[in-house]
Amino acid sequence: LCQGSNYSTCASCPSCPDRWMKYGNHCYYFSVEEKDWNSSLEFCLARDSHLLVITDNQEMSLLQVFLSEAFCWIGLRNNSGWRWEDGSPLNFSRISSNSFVQTCGAINKNGLQASSCEVPLHWVCKKCPFADQALF
């Protein structure tokens, strides 16, 4: 682990890999191509990262600056309630969800949106620089 990191942050970290953006104490990857939710998750895991888990409203607002109308997959799913991939519940923001069949979470510049998981979307990975294991 890079110095000062814990499960949700990595402070005083070195720079991020190519094509990743350093923001705060984390590295973010904004995809150019589109995949379904599961394939997006696999892409992130293969790079020692995880589909974006947002820790608070501040992080969400900061990231939305880099987003457009296009939705991006994030590490949020509805399994008897909306939960992040780290197991924590979604409690700082509302997700626009209309249908029981929409069980994966996405984000755009306007907020969080539920979608059917096989829809091909852009995605966002998040990690600590240089394979730090504090993934979220």
Partner: antibody
Framework: QVTLRESGPALVKPTQTLTLTCTVS??????????VGWIRQPPGKALEWLAH???????WYELALKSRLTISKDTSKNQVVLTITNMDPVDTATYYC?????????????????WGQGTTVTVSS | DVVMTQTPLSLSVTPGQPASISCKSS???????????LEWYLQKPGQSPQLLIY???NRFSGVPDRFSGSGSGTDFTLKISRVEAEDVGVYYC?????????FGQGTKLEIK
């Protein structure tokens, strides 16, 4: 609570144009992944898909009827309108609108998770 | 077009007994994304259709667990483990994997 309600004339004459309106509530017609479709059911027969329109105004029609169908939406009024030209007695049916959920294809695969109560249209002179 | 053929076209079941409806497609309805878009709808007398099962085996919200869907490729089945009086109506299978989307001709379930 999601609801859809169809409205339109109960009787039309052959060669006339039928205009059906679906008024929705409980969701927005502009929300990503949402659409509204029209399905009809002739008396004693099976269901037949006619057309659907997506949140971004992308429209799809049943090929055999495409030249006669027009689907449109007015997001501010929460309404989807289907028009069918040159009506014929074989078009006599109950017409349903249903909400359709996007799975990644504009033309097909989706779930119709909520339906209106239907409106019966008879074509007769 | 993909033809969806349901059997039987009607069945009469004693309350508490199981029921099974078959739906066969004229070609495979496994989509290129590996999902199978096969759904089951129930149209109760005088009502509009309602979604029961989506993507072969997933129960829609509020659908009792006595309803289950199974199958793959071209052969699909809807099972009701214990039929209740409220289950009467016409059951339709629906495929959304290929354009145009198509429905089966319907199976009428009655109570003995």
């Amino acid at each position: 609570q999601v609801t859809l309600r169809e409205s339109g004339p109960a009787l039309v004459k052959p060669t006339q144009t039928l205009t059906l309106t679906c008024t929705v509530s409980g969701f927005s017609l502009s929300t990503f992944g949402m659409g509204v479709g029209w399905i009809r059911q002739p008396p004693g027969k099976a269901l037949e898909w006619l057309a659907h329109i997506w949140w971004d105004d992308d429209k799809w029609y049943e090929l055999a009827l495409k030249s006669r169908l027009t689907i449109s939406k007015d997001t501010s009024k929460n309404q989807v309108v289907l028009t069918i030209t040159n009506m014929d007695p074989v078009d006599t049916a109950t017409y349903y609108c249903a909400r359709v959920i996007y799975y990644g294809s504009r033309s097909a695969y989706y779930s119709m998770d909520y339906w209106g109560q239907g409106t019966t249209v008879t074509v007769s002179s | 077009d993909v033809v969806m053929t349901q059997t039987p076209l009607s069945l009469s079941v004693t309350p508490g007994q199981p029921a099974s409806i078959s739906c066969k497609s004229s070609q495979s309805i496994v989509h290129s994304n590996a999902h199978t878009y096969l759904e089951w709808y129930l149209q109760k007398p005088g009502q509009s259709p309602q979604l029961l099962i989506y993507k072969v085996s997933n129960r829609f919200s509020g659908v009792p667990d006595r309803f289950s869907g199974s199958g793959s490729g071209t052969d699909f089945t809807l099972k009701i483990s214990r039929v209740e009086a409220e289950d009467v109506g016409v059951y339709y299978c629906f495929q959304g994997s290929h354009v145009p989307v198509t429905f089966g001709q319907g199976t009428k379930l009655e109570i003995k």
